[in-house]
């Protein structure tokens, strides 16, 4: 009996045309929505005259339908028993699920000047910049719409810059039309424990963003694993959005509309610094704004993002240390709403729900030669605005799940 | 590859001129924002000049304001630092520095120096 379930499993889960896992992979049957909320700045002016801490209050959710297009360009490649494809972007506001419109107002830091003033370090380039925020009446912070903020809009400081420089911003810009990859995942056709494991992104098998085993893709994209998951292992998975490599294990049983799975979630050990977790040496990438790699909980992704100054930290600083933080007035960090989770269905290594939780955040720094941040006396990784990406399969889903998987076991 | 060669330096009396010449190469000239920069013993590098990519407005640091005067030749790639009532002050090594932007990028070359000693 349970070796002919093993065998259905196996069969199943390979990612060719034909199979329950081919189904669901192509186009996810789960509706998954992107959650924002921004952090609106209450006092803009004490903090640039007087450098004081940045007061936030948390305005959302502001939620978005994503991950609802099909992949495009799938193509199975025999010879090495791997399937390529690309992940389209697409977002609908939805606005029953949220507390205002994509045209509601927020003060936000500016982020085309603290860009600007970290990537374009030329003494003579500042001066430019300066005197082109002052024209554009640009300050440290701006009040923007959520669609602005998220989307893009074209910044007026950087329109008047007499070079081809990139005008429009955005923190997701560009995000609508294009697509994530091309990903080439092993479809486990020849052998079953590597299904969906990533053999390469962008056609490398490194990101060139980081040092040593740091750089490297593991694991799946986390929408699914090898089949017979067992509580013990470590869950490697690959995430675009944050530029890297990470991994999950085992925290709980959880019960799913009636579907025994297993919780895994993002260790605390993950977010830590070198001194406490030897293996993240290769995250730090310098040794200003990390206090010689003592900091933790923010990750400097900017070698991803042409430059610009991204830190990636989980929501209100969750396992960030105290002096990340400290600047920031407002921040409520707990475990259960901040940290990201998966719910395994073990026997398939299929995600049936899933809280992807992360925090965009931006440095800014003091700058001599920029007036609008003269009066700086310390660097901020100042927040802008953290996701919850969830899904959670249908019950039209669950019951079949139940019927043909589960069911058949018990 | 992206070259600067300054050359115009040595030594003049005080109240004497200099003419220091950068001449570039490996790139695209007239894209570039050119400057010389002095840094003298024991001194940070101080911008002294600056002329962007057009000849728009040219900036100077106040000491050398009407002594100083800045000028580019895109036909010959070459920017120029006409130097006159020179100051013992003024003795420094003279670097010339070529920047743009494209895109988040910013492209910045400089020069091995030329040496302006002023004195009697």
């Known amino acids: 009996g349970d070796l002919l379930i093993q065998k259905t499993i196996k069969k199943q889960v390979v990612l060719e045309e034909g199979t329950i896992a081919f189904k669901n992979w192509v186009k996810t049957g789960t509706e998954v929505y992107r959650q924002f909320w921004i952090f609106d700045v209450q006092n803009p002016q004490e903090v640039m005259m007087n450098s004081s801490n940045i007061q936030v209050k948390q305005r959302g959710p502001y939620t978005y339908r994503v991950r609802f297009l099909a992949k495009e360009n799938v193509t199975q490649d025999a010879e090495d028993n791997t399937v390529s494809f690309l992940q389209p972007n697409g977002a609908i506001f939805e606005p029953s699920l949220s507390v205002g419109t994509e045209a509601d107002n927020f003060t936000v830091l500016n982020l085309a000047v603290a860009a600007a003033s970290h990537i374009y370090q030329n003494q003579f380039v500042q001066m430019i910049l300066n005197s082109l925020i002052n024209k554009s009446k640009s300050s440290m912070f701006q009040v923007r719409t959520l669609r602005e903020l998220l989307w893009g809009y074209r910044d007026p400081f950087l329109s008047l810059v007499p070079y081809p420089v990139t005008t429009t911003v955005g923190l997701f810009y560009p995000y609508n039309n294009t697509a994530d990859g091309v990903y080439k995942v092993f479809n486990g056709k020849d052998n079953i424990s590597k299904v969906a494991i990533i053999d390469t992104y962008k056609g490398k098998r490194n990101l060139s963003y980081w040092e040593s085993h740091c750089d490297m893709i593991n694991g799946t994209d986390a929408a699914s694993f090898p089949p017979f998951v067992e509580k013990s292992q470590v869950l490697q998975f690959f995430s675009s959005d944050i530029c890297r490599s990470i991994y999950a294990v085992f925290e709980s049983d959880v019960n799913l509309k009636g579907i025994p799975v297993y919780r895994f979630v993002l260790p605390s050990k993950a977010f830590a610094s070198p001194v406490e977790n030897p293996d993240n040496y290769c995250f730090c990438t310098e040794k200003i704004i990390s206090k010689n790699c003592t900091s933790y909980g923010v990750l400097d992704i900017s070698k991803c993002k042409e430059g610009r100054p991204v830190y990636i930290s989980l929501p209100h600083f969750l396992y960030a240390s105290p002096d990340v933080s400290e600047p920031i007035d407002g921040l409520n960090p707990n475990e259960e709403e901040h940290r990201t989770y998966l719910d395994i269905e073990p026997i398939t290594g299929f995600t049936l729900q899933f809280a992807k939780r992360l925090q965009v955040n931006l440095l800014v720094k003091p700058s001599e030669k920029i007036q609008v941040l003269k009066n700086l006396k310390r660097n901020y990784i100042v927040p802008i605005l953290w996701l919850n990406e969830t899904g959670t399969i249908g019950d039209e889903k669950a019951n079949m799940f139940r019927s043909q998987v589960t069911g058949k076991i018990n | 590859q992206v070259q600067l060669q300054e050359s115009g330096g040595g030594l003049v009396q005080p109240g004497g001129s200099l003419r220091l010449s950068c001449t570039a190469s490996?790139?695209?000239?007239?894209?570039?924002?050119m400057s010389w920069y002095r840094q003298a013993p024991g001194k940070e590098r101080e911008l002294v000049a600056a002329?962007?990519?057009?000849?728009?407005?040219?900036y100077y640091v106040d000491s050398v304001k009407g002594r100083f005067s800045i000028s580019r030749d895109n036909a010959k790639n070459t920017v120029y630092l006409q130097m006159n009532s020179l100051k013992p002050e003024d003795t420094a090594v003279y670097y010339c520095?070529?920047?743009?932007?494209?895109?988040?990028?910013?492209?910045?070359?400089w020069g091995q120096g030329t040496q302006v000693t002023v004195s009697s």
């Open positions: 002329i962007p990519h057009d000849g728009g407005s040219i």
């Open positions: 490996g790139f695209t000239f007239s894209s570039y924002a």
């Open positions: 520095n070529a920047v743009t932007l494209q895109g988040w990028r910013e492209y910045d070359y």
